[in-house]
Every structure is written in C-alpha cells, then in structure tokens.
C-alpha cells in the first residue's frame, strides 16, 4: 500500500525514573557494583543535558491517506512513526537506574513501535468502481527496546518498569535542576 503524507506533529517519550531499564541479568557480570545500589550522590554538570527533548524517543504523528493502486481512503488516518534517541549517554541526576554507568560503553537501545492498532478504512476508487473496505495496521505507540547479545535488531528486548531501590551510602548532593531532572534518560540509540 502507498502512503501520502498530509501533516505531522510529534510527541516525546521521556520515561520516568521507574521505567529505567535494568540490563537483563545474563548481560551483567556478577559484580555488585552499581550506582543505585551503592548510593552514590547524583553528579551535577557532566551528566546533565540542557535539552531533554533533544534525546527523547519521539512519536511523530503522521496523518496520511491509505492508497491501494488507484484507490484512496476517503479520510486520512493518523499513525505514529518512532524516531529519535532513547536517551543520550549524558545522564541526568538520579536517572542512572542500575546500569554500570561508569563504563565507556553500555547497553544499546532503539526507539521502535511498541503497540499497534487495526483500523478499517474505506477506499474510494476512480471510474465509479464500488468502494471497498480494508483493514490497516497502524503504530499506536513507541518504546525504547534494548539490543541484546541474544537478539538481533528485529528482535528487540523490551524494558519494563523498575522500582527505584532505596539508596544507601553517601547522601545525594543537592540537585541543581528542577523536576525535569527526575526524568530518566536511557542509553543512546538512533
């Protein structure tokens, strides 16, 4: 089927702290060192980013007509295209989750479709042909999913909510940012 763009806008997916992924157990080594468990204070400058939206996994809303040969839908349909970053390597305070953040390289995420919806459309055809109904599958939401050593890019691993662990050890340094700093930024993807 062909698509004709009509208009688009964007929604950003910026997960809350509880949604920060814990890399699957089989991908982490057995050392107990990690930032949330060991209660380090949130760092300031180096881990902050000025524009959170610059790195978010975006849901771009496209309004399109469905076409099939010479036939075209009577009304446009709106669907999402997943785009942008799942989060930068530059992390926000308190947004580290249980990842081994001090490593120079880490888990890779992708912004891809999460849920789909089916929509019935009516196709109008030229030359007086009878309209026909057709069901199309449209992207309903986007999500960051991890590439793992056991998955290729077409089999991406989901991450789900994770309860933030109570912190122990050092007391956090006062945060320089506002509420937006609570929003977790995930690993970088493209």
């Amino acid at each position: 089927q062909g698509w004709q763009a009509f208009k688009n806008d964007a929604t950003e997916i910026i997960p809350e702290l509880g949604e920060y992924p814990e890399p699957p157990p089989e991908l982490e080594n057995n050392k107990t060192m990690n930032r949330a468990e060991n209660g380090g204070r949130p760092p300031h400058h180096p881990f902050e980013t000025k524009d959170v939206s610059e790195y978010s996994c975006r849901e771009l809303h496209f309004t399109r007509y469905v076409t099939d040969g010479q036939c075209r839908s009577a009304k446009p349909v709106t669907e999402l295209v997943c785009s942008g970053q799942c989060g930068p390597a530059r992390l926000l305070p308190n947004a580290i989750g249980r990842g081994k953040w001090w490593r120079p390289s880490g888990p890779d995420f992708r912004c891809i479709p999460d849920r789909y919806r089916a929509q019935r459309v009516q196709l109008l055809c030229p030359g007086g042909a009878a309209p026909r109904a057709r069901k199309v599958r449209l992207v309903a939401s986007c999500k960051c999913k991890r590439l793992t050593r056991f998955h290729n890019q077409s089999e991406l691993k989901d991450f789900g909510p994770e309860a933030a662990r109570p912190q122990k050890g050092r007391k956090p340094r006062p945060r320089a940012r506002g509420a937006k700093a609570n929003q977790a930024e995930l690993e970088n993807a493209y």
Epitope: L27, N29, N30, K31, T32, M33, N34, R35, N38, G40, P43, H44, H45, P46, F47, P88, A89, R90, L91, I96, G99, K100, W101, W102, R103, P104, S105, G106, P107, D108, R146, L147, T148, R149, F150, H151, N152, G169, E187, N188, A189, Y190
Partner: antibody, heavy 119, light 111 residues
Framework: EVQLVESGGGLVQPGRSLRLSCAAS????????LHWVRQAPGKGLEWVSG????????DYADSVKGRFTISRDNAKNSLYLQMNSLRVEDTALYYC????????????WGQGTTVTVSS | QSVLTQPPSASGTPGQRVTISCSGS????????VNWYQQLPGTAPKLLIY???QRPSGVPDRFSGSKSGTSASLAISGLQSEDEADYYC????????????FGGGTKLTVL
C-alpha cells in the same frame, strides 16, 4: 583546562611491581569515571581497568586481573594503578583516561607514562 | 588479535569520503554502544564518536558514526590532510566478566 597527567612509569624487571599515578585538574574529579588504557610499542590500544567514584565500581581486563589494582583518591584528585607480578608483555605506554558521560566513551586523556618490563 | 576487527589501512585524497569498518559480535557491538577514537601521530587518543553516532563538542560534522547489527562504521567526508591518523573503534564486551574492547586500529593515509 581539563588535564590528566600520568607519572610513575619506568624500567622494571619481570615479576616486580610498579605504581602509576594520574593527577587530574580542571574538572570535578569525582564526577568522572576513570580508566587506564595502554598501548604497546607500535601496537593498538588496550583497555586495562576502570573505576567509578567508589572502590566497588571496578572493572579489569582479563589480562591483568589478579595482578593489577586500580584505585582513586578523590581528596587528592588522583587515580592509581598498582601493578604487581609484571610481565614483559605489560611493556607499554599507559594512558589515564576519563569519561564524563555514562556509556559515553573516554573523552579526557592524559599524555601517558611509559612502563618497560625487561630483564 | 583484537576482538573487534578493523582494516589495517585506508586511504583517500583530500575532499573524498572515506569509510572505516569495525566488525564485532553479538556480545559487544551487537548489544552495546560503539565509540570511535582518533590518534594523531605521537599524541594521545581523542574521542571522536560516542554512543554509535554522537559527536562530542568540537568534533567536526565531517565525522559520522553508524551501527548495524554487529558492525559499525566511521565515515569521514571532505577528507583533509590533518585527518591522517589511526582510528580505533571500541565497545563494551559482555562475555565472561566483561571488558572494554578496542579494534586493532586503522591507519588512514591522506594521499
């Protein structure tokens, strides 16, 4: 200016020990993860070890595990590498490097200190 | 032998576009982000690309990174004489207890 300066290299016999130091300036030291990377003469880069801001946030390359110990002293803005049971194959230029972003590569490097292990 | 495989050499003329490949496996490039470093003769390495395709401030946009499956690439467009250097890819490797692995390096010659 962000700066890392390594010291402590030299000529040492196989089986002996050496301690490398890295002095940092120009940035908030304990916000950085720090690493040692070495480069044998005419060869490529080899990561040796890395540390977060606490002593339980540590990784080692298999080739040095059990022989080398990485540590840091945030009060002194210093990183250390204690190298024991040195081998001829440990001969290299040792760089101190840091990353200011989680999973964001080593974005600060020193100029290196040379370790030569030879009898 | 390096865990990540790079061609030992590459070359191009000024203004040309050159691509350097880096091949790994599912335990490194396949699941983790890739970084690229430039090492000019007689100097310390410099971070060129982090997290597959992100440029640190100060790195010209002539340099770009990409990743697909278990391979990554560094592209340099509008090649300049000062780009003559060794280039290294690197990624975390999840096998065993894990380590940060580098490619063997690619010597880029500007003809």
């Amino acid at each position: 200016e962000v700066q890392l300066v390594e010291s402590g290299g030299g000529l040492v016999q196989p089986g002996r020990s050496l301690r490398l130091s890295c002095a940092a300036s120009g940035f908030t030291f304990d916000d950085y993860a720090l690493h040692w990377v070495r480069q044998a003469p005419g060869k490529g880069l080899e990561w040796v070890s890395g540390i977060g801001w606490e002593d339980d946030m540590i990784d080692y390359a298999d080739s040095v595990k059990g022989r080398f110990t990485i540590s840091r002293d945030n009060a002194k803005n210093s990183l250390y590498l204690q190298m024991n049971s040195l081998r001829v194959e440990d001969t290299a230029l040792y760089y101190c490097a840091g990353n200011s972003r989680g999973y964001g590569g080593l974005d600060v490097w020193g100029q290196g200190t040379t370790v030569t292990v030879s009898s | 032998q390096s865990v990540l495989t790079q061609p030992p050499s590459a070359s191009g003329t000024p203004g040309q576009r050159v691509t350097i490949s880096c091949s790994g496996s599912s335990s490194n490039i396949g699941g983790n982000t890739v970084n690229w470093y430039q090492q000019l003769p007689g100097t310390a390495p410099k971070l060129l690309i982090y997290s597959n395709n992100q440029r640190p401030s100060g790195v010209p946009d002539r340099f770009s990174g990409s990743k697909s499956g278990t391979s990554a690439s560094l592209a340099i467009s509008g090649l300049q004489s000062e780009d003559e250097a060794d280039y290294y890819c690197a990624a975390w490797d999840d096998s065993l207890e894990g380590s940060y692995v580098f490619g063997g390096g690619t010597k880029l010659t500007v003809l």
